[in-house]
């Protein structure tokens, strides 16, 4: 079978401050099993934005029903955007591992730009 790919179709997204940003991500397969996580930035200092497995992310909602057994849409919405949210967001597939899940494949990233509210 084809190896899983993580597709972020939007290279960039422009959102006005105070609005909601939609960051799109799909996987091409359900295998290997393991969670999706969203990060802002890359490398060791990246910031976790959303973790499918656990955690409380009050500004983030998922576009699709992630409890569907055949779900491959991992797009998210981030509410009440501010200029501090600007950056490149990566959708990352992990495969299960012990004791920790292992990063398997990352999307190419989506750059979020924030347009200031007109005064």
């Amino acid at each position: 079978e084809e190896e899983l790919q993580v597709i972020q179709p939007d290279k960039s997204v422009l959102v006005a401050a105070g609005e909601t940003a939609t960051l799109r991500c799909t996987a091409t397969s359900l295998i290997p099993v393991g969670p999706i996580q969203w990060f802002r930035g890359a490398g060791p200092g990246r910031e976790l934005i959303y973790n499918q497995k656990e955690g409380h992310f009050p500004r983030v909602t998922t576009v699709s029903d992630l409890t569907k057994r055949n779900n491959m849409d991992f797009s998210i919405r981030i509410g009440n955007i501010t200029p501090a949210d600007a950056g490149t967001y990566y959708c990352v597939k992990f495969r299960k591992g012990s004791p920790d899940d292992v990063e398997f494949k990352s999307g190419a990233g989506t750059e979020l730009s924030v347009r200031a509210k007109p005064s």
Partner: antibody, heavy 117, light 108 residues
Framework: DVQLVESGGGVVRPGESLRLSCAVS????????MSWVRQAPGKGLEWVSG???????YYVDSVKGRFTISRDNSKNTLYLQVNSLTAEDTAIYYC???????????WGLGTLVTVSS | SYELTQPPSVSVSPGQTARITCSGG??????YAWYQQKPGQAPVTVIH???KRPSDIPERFSGSSSGTTVTLTISGVQAEDEADYYC???????????FGGGTKLTVL
């Protein structure tokens, strides 16, 4: 505290129907997938059916077309409509909350369905 | 579809270590869990996601996986651990949950 309380079991004749219910409390029901698992007397566990938070449904082959899982998120209740019952359906039926990866973390106490002529 | 195979029975003395194995499924497409069931009671989840222990389960319960075999380990077994233990799997290829036949743990 997470609680799942099944009801609706009973003694029925072959070919008859029942509607099982599972009332939940202690968590945001609308955010979780749920399942029904059954256990025949003296036997092991068998997964019967699952439903996503949004209502997508899944069944084991042996009950497809006879059983229907549903949920009412406004009533915090999970249902299993069981039709055309046979003796092989005699079991304790448990409802269970699913984890993010479709395993089970919390279980109800079960409701007994007995099919006998 | 796949089957999960576990031994029908395991016996251990109090304070010793009990290991219950479960084989079947494919590592890359299957998540595993362990469920404890005492006579006349509902199942209780003691391990999920191969090796994750719920917060209310004693630390003596642990799970591990290697290839297509997963293992439930109970360190320092106590009399109250006597029960049936079922391994369960979720297969991401078929969307189906499967259970092993169960293992009766006897504390001598």
């Amino acid at each position: 505290d997470v609680q799942l309380v099944e009801s609706g079991g009973g003694v029925v004749r072959p070919g008859e129907s029942l509607r099982l219910s599972c009332a939940v409390s202690g968590f945001r029901f609308s955010s979780y997938a749920m399942s029904w698992v059954r256990q025949a007397p003296g036997k092991g566990l068998e997964w019967v059916s699952g439903i996503s938070s949004g209502g997508d449904t899944y069944y084991v082959d042996s009950v497809k077309g006879r059983f229907t899982i549903s949920r009412d998120n406004s009533k915090n209740t999970l249902y299993l409509q069981v039709n055309s019952l046979t003796a092989e359906d005699t079991a304790i039926y448990y409802c269970a909350r699913e984890t993010w990866n479709h395993l089970f973390d919390y279980w109800g106490l079960g409701t007994l369905v007995t099919v006998s002529s | 579809s796949y089957e999960l195979t576990q031994p029908p029975s395991v016996s251990v003395s109090p304070g010793q270590t009990a290991r219950i194995t479960c084989s079947g499924g494919d590592y890359y497409s299957t998540y595993y869990a362990w469920y404890q069931q005492k006579p006349g009671q509902a199942p209780v989840t003691v391990i999920h996601s191969d090796d994750k222990r719920p917060s209310d389960i004693p630390e003596r319960f642990s799970g591990s996986s290697s290839g297509t075999t997963v293992t439930l380990t109970i360190s320092g077994v106590q009399a109250e651990d006597e029960a049936d233990y079922y391994c369960g799997g979720y297969d991401g290829r078929t969307y189906i949950n499967t259970f092993g036949g169960g293992t009766k743990l006897t504390v001598l």
